[in-house]
Each structure stands twice: as structure tokens, then as C-alpha cells.
């Protein structure tokens, strides 16, 4: 799903307050709901009719440092006999997510949000005929 | 996929630098790669064998303000005849993502990262038998 552009108003103080210095804001350390965890069924990536593999990317100047990307294993979907059925398509499910980027110049450290596209998994879809207008 | 706990070191300056004031850091405004967009196949939520609906939640003090959650339409999966096949299971695919929470006390505005669980879509899986030990 798409993340809309960040409105200028989001970083502004209420109208009755003195304006904020341009360019940076105060970021509290710590994460709200940090202990919240996914409660997904196990091994769905291998049990799915549109199975996928995971690839991990690592960046120490990003939080989270580890970002996991899924890749569909097949073009078609796996049928009841365990064979690839190409009358159906395995397609990736993508999500726009935010990460926190750490930037330093000498002893000056600042942070900035970064949008990352994550392929979360795959689903099996029925293809449709492209009807030429 | 799980987001690990934010290490205390992530918010720290290099060792040779004077320590950071406890509790807050500098957040640059603007988003890196803000114009990046998902390039998913269209209408996959209705064409999937494990179709889903979307629900939008809205919070003006969160960026993004709009967070979209998927809910699987069926317990089973849709077969070639368009009927629900309960020998297979529609299961949600979840993703831990970050949002930016805006907090104000009077004219003081600060921001904090918040972890949110997003159900991105659904996939069709083969159920497994639970073998009792």
C-alpha cells in the first residue's frame, strides 16, 4: 500500500506557537510498542501455493538494520499434486514501510525517515485476458 | 517479519565524540525516497485464491496518517470453480512496520517511532496435521 507524501503541516507546531527552526525536529529515543510481534502461521512461505524465499539485507546505519525481502519461487502456483500450474500466477505482495536512517558528519549525528519497498510474501492469482480497446 | 529491538548504540555518537543528551535526537524533516511507489499487479486482493478486503485506519498524529489493514475474506481458498475449498487455508501475511508518532505538550512538539503490525494480504496454504508427541 502507498504511503502518501509527508505534509509540511505534520512537522509544524500549532498555529499559536512560535515557528519551528527549518529542517530538523526532536526525535525521542525508544520505540513505542517495541515488543509487539507478528503472530503469523508458521512456515507459510513454504506451505503456500505461491511459495517464496527470503533474502536479508543488512545496514548498520538503518533501523531496523535487517530488512527481509521475499521472492516468489515460481511463476505459476503449486497445485494439489505439487506441480506448477501456469494457468495461475504467483505474484508478490508489496508494502511501503518506513525505516530510520542514521547520518553522521564527524560528531554530528542526525536521523531521517526513509521509505523502503518490502516484498512481504506472495499470493496466487487468476490471470485475466488483456482486452485491447 | 520481526523488527529487532533498537540497540542503545544506534542512537549514540561515535566513541570519540562527547555524549548525546539523554532522551532525544535530531530528526531531519523530509523523507528519503519519498516518491518510491509499489509496483504490484493490480486487483490482486480480488483475484487471489485467498482474497482479502482492506480497512483503513486514520490518525492525524501519525505518519503515515493512513494505515491500511487487510482481512482475509474466507477461511478456505477459492478453487477454479469459484467455490471455497476448505481443504486449504487462507492465512494473513503480516509485516512489522514503523510509523512516526507526533506528540505535543503545549507548544513543544516531539516525535517518536512506533512499531505497527500490518496485515498486508493473504496467501493460500496447505494445512498440516498436528502430530501429538
Amino acid at each position: 500500500r502507498k504511503i502518501p507524501k509527508v505534509g509540511h503541516t505534520f512537522f509544524q507546531k500549532p498555529e499559536s506557537c512560535p515557528p519551528v527552526p527549518e529542517g530538523s525536529m526532536k526525535l525521542d529515543t525508544g520505540i513505542i510498542n517495541e515488543n509487539q510481534r507478528v503472530s503469523m502461521s508458521r512456515n507459510i512461505e513454504s506451505r503456500s501455493t505461491s511459495p517464496w524465499n527470503y533474502t536479508v539485507t543488512w545496514d548498520p546505519n538503518r533501523y531496523p538494520s535487517e530488512v527481509v525481502q521475499a521472492q516468489c519461487k515460481h511463476l505459476g502456483c503449486i497445485n494439489a499434486q505439487g506441480k506448477e500450474d501456469i494457468s495461475m500466477n504467483s505474484v508478490p505482495i508489496q508494502q511501503e514501510t518506513l525505516v530510520l536512517r542514521r547520518k553522521h558528519q564527524g560528531c554530528s549525528v542526525s536521523f531521517q525517515l526513509e521509505k523502503v519497498l518490502v516484498t512481504v510474501g506472495c499470493t496466487c492469482v487468476t490471470p485475466v485476458v488483456h482486452h485491447v480497446q | 517479519r520481526k523488527i529487532p529491538k533498537v540497540g542503545h548504540t544506534f542512537f549514540q555518537k561515535p566513541e570519540s565524540c562527547p555524549p548525546v543528551p539523554e532522551g532525544s535526537m535530531k530528526l531531519d524533516t523530509g523523507i528519503i525516497n519519498e516518491n518510491q511507489r509499489v509496483s504490484m499487479s493490480r486487483n490482486i486482493e480480488s483475484r487471489s485464491t485467498s482474497p482479502w478486503n482492506y480497512t483503513v485506519t486514520w490518525d492525524p498524529n501519525r505518519y503515515p496518517s493512513e494505515v491500511v489493514q487487510a482481512q482475509c475474506k474466507h477461511l478456505g481458498c477459492i478453487n477454479a470453480q469459484g467455490k471455497e475449498d476448505i481443504s486449504m487455508n487462507s492465512v494473513p501475511i503480516q509485516q512489522e512496520t514503523l510509523v512516526l508518532r507526533r506528540k505535543h505538550q503545549g507548544c513543544s512538539v516531539s516525535f517518536q517511532l512506533e512499531k505497527v503490525l500490518v496485515t498486508v494480504g493473504c496467501t493460500c496454504v496447505t494445512p498440516v496435521v498436528h502430530h501429538v508427541q
Partner: antibody, heavy 123, light 108 residues
């Protein structure tokens, strides 16, 4: 006019490489998956490779896997086939074909074909 | 791998006659079978997809039928431009897009 025009064929020695191109016009290129299909002289049709709209899905026939690479440049409305380690049995007329699937996905039927470009592998 | 066998290899008929071409699959391809026409020196042209659906611009004299392993392409009344080679193709199982060996429809 809606058309596909292949180029890049020619005479090449076994073991060498060749790159085929297909220029698409008259339609929105990235709305479609695309394929290469070949036909040896006097023989039938053989699917070689296919690629979906955003290059996220790619497939190859076993006979060319590991030797041929399909790619596309949506900004240039072009499809490519990089052919390495060519063999005599790769000699054929190579057609560029448009998939009839909607949303740039595979349907595995071919609704529009080019005229083909001839690849001859011989010493 | 699914093998598609077309018969007869050659069909000799006169204009105005009915042509019946057969395609047999080595295992079920359900209804996921297409037919193409190829004239000498030309690229193939899609006629029928998913066993019985006519492609855009294909005349009504062309019809397809069958499911599972046995399929038929019928040309109700041959026109001079219909003399060509016809190929069937499946889109059911990997490897995709396997074609039959072709049936040549020639003028008697």
C-alpha cells in the same frame, strides 16, 4: 500501428554470443508480459523465454536455461534476449511475442507477434 | 512435460469444405489450449484460446472445442486464405507454452 520488430540476428560461430532486440510500438509496452519464441527451419514452434511487466517474473525453457538472458527496458519500449554459448541447435527464426495477459502478468498465450529475426549458428 | 500430438500431419481439402483438426495432450491440460495459424513466411496468429474462445478479429468459421486431453479446431467452410499450418499450444503445466507439431491444411 501496433507492431513488434525484431533485430540483431545473424550468422555466429558456436560458443559465441548474440543479442536480439525487439522494438514495440503502438501500445503501452509495460501493460504486457513479453516472450521470445523460436522456430527452427522447417520445424515447429518452441517457447524460449518470457518476462512479466516489471521484470519481477522471468522464465526460460530448459534448453536455454543458464545460457540465455531475457530483459526489458520499459522506458525504451524494448525487449532483449542475450544469447551466450550458442549451439548449432539454436539456429532458428526468433520471434518476439506479446502475452495476452492483463496487468502485465502471464497468460501464456501470444496475441501479437513480430516477423522474426534469423539466427544461424555455424562454423 | 506435456506432449501435444496433432493429427493428421497433413489435411488435403478443397475450398468450401469443413476442416477438422485434432490435438491430443499426453495428460490433462483442462481447458487451457490455444490454436494458432501460420502462413508461409509469416508469423503465427492466435485463433482460439482456452479451448473455445475466439481471439479478437477471428472469423466465426473458426471454432474450438474439447477439454482434458482431446481438442478439436473446426473450420466450417474453408476459404482460400485458410490454407496454412495450424499449431495447438497448452498453458496448463510447466514448462509453459508447449506447442504441438502442427497440421498442414493444403489445397486438394
Amino acid at each position: 500501428e501496433v507492431q513488434l520488430v525484431e533485430s540483431g540476428g545473424g550468422l555466429v560461430q558456436p560458443g559465441r554470443s548474440l543479442r536480439l532486440s525487439c522494438a514495440a510500438s503502438g501500445f503501452t509496452f509495460d501493460d504486457y508480459a513479453m516472450h521470445w519464441v523460436r522456430q527452427a527451419p522447417g520445424k515447429g514452434l518452441e517457447w524460449v523465454s518470457g518476462i512479466n511487466w516489471n521484470s519481477g517474473g522471468i522464465g526460460y525453457a530448459d534448453s536455454v536455461k543458464g545460457r540465455f538472458t531475457i530483459s526489458r527496458d520499459n522506458a525504451k519500449n524494448s525487449l532483449y534476449l542475450q544469447m551466450n554459448s550458442l549451439r548449432a541447435e539454436d539456429t532458428a527464426l526468433y520471434y518476439c511475442a506479446r502475452d495476452m495477459g492483463g496487468f502485465g502478468e502471464f497468460y501464456w498465450n501470444f496475441g501479437l507477434w513480430g516477423r522474426g529475426t534469423l539466427v544461424t549458428v555455424s562454423s | 512435460e506435456i506432449v501435444l500430438t496433432q493429427s493428421p500431419a497433413t489435411l488435403s481439402l478443397s475450398p468450401g469444405e469443413r476442416a477438422t483438426l485434432s490435438c491430443r495432450a499426453s495428460q490433462s491440460v483442462r481447458s487451457y489450449l490455444a490454436w494458432y495459424q501460420q502462413k508461409p513466411g509469416q508469423a503465427p496468429r492466435l485463433l482460439i484460446y482456452d479451448a473455445s474462445n475466439r481471439a479478437t478479429g477471428i472469423p466465426a468459421r473458426f471454432s474450438g472445442s474439447g477439454s482434458g486431453t482431446d481438442f478439436t479446431l473446426t473450420i466450417s467452410s474453408l476459404e482460400p486464405e485458410d490454407f496454412a499450418v495450424y499449431y495447438c499450444q497448452q498453458r496448463s503445466n510447466w514448462p509453459p507454452a508447449t506447442f504441438g507439431g502442427g497440421t498442414k491444411v493444403e489445397i486438394k
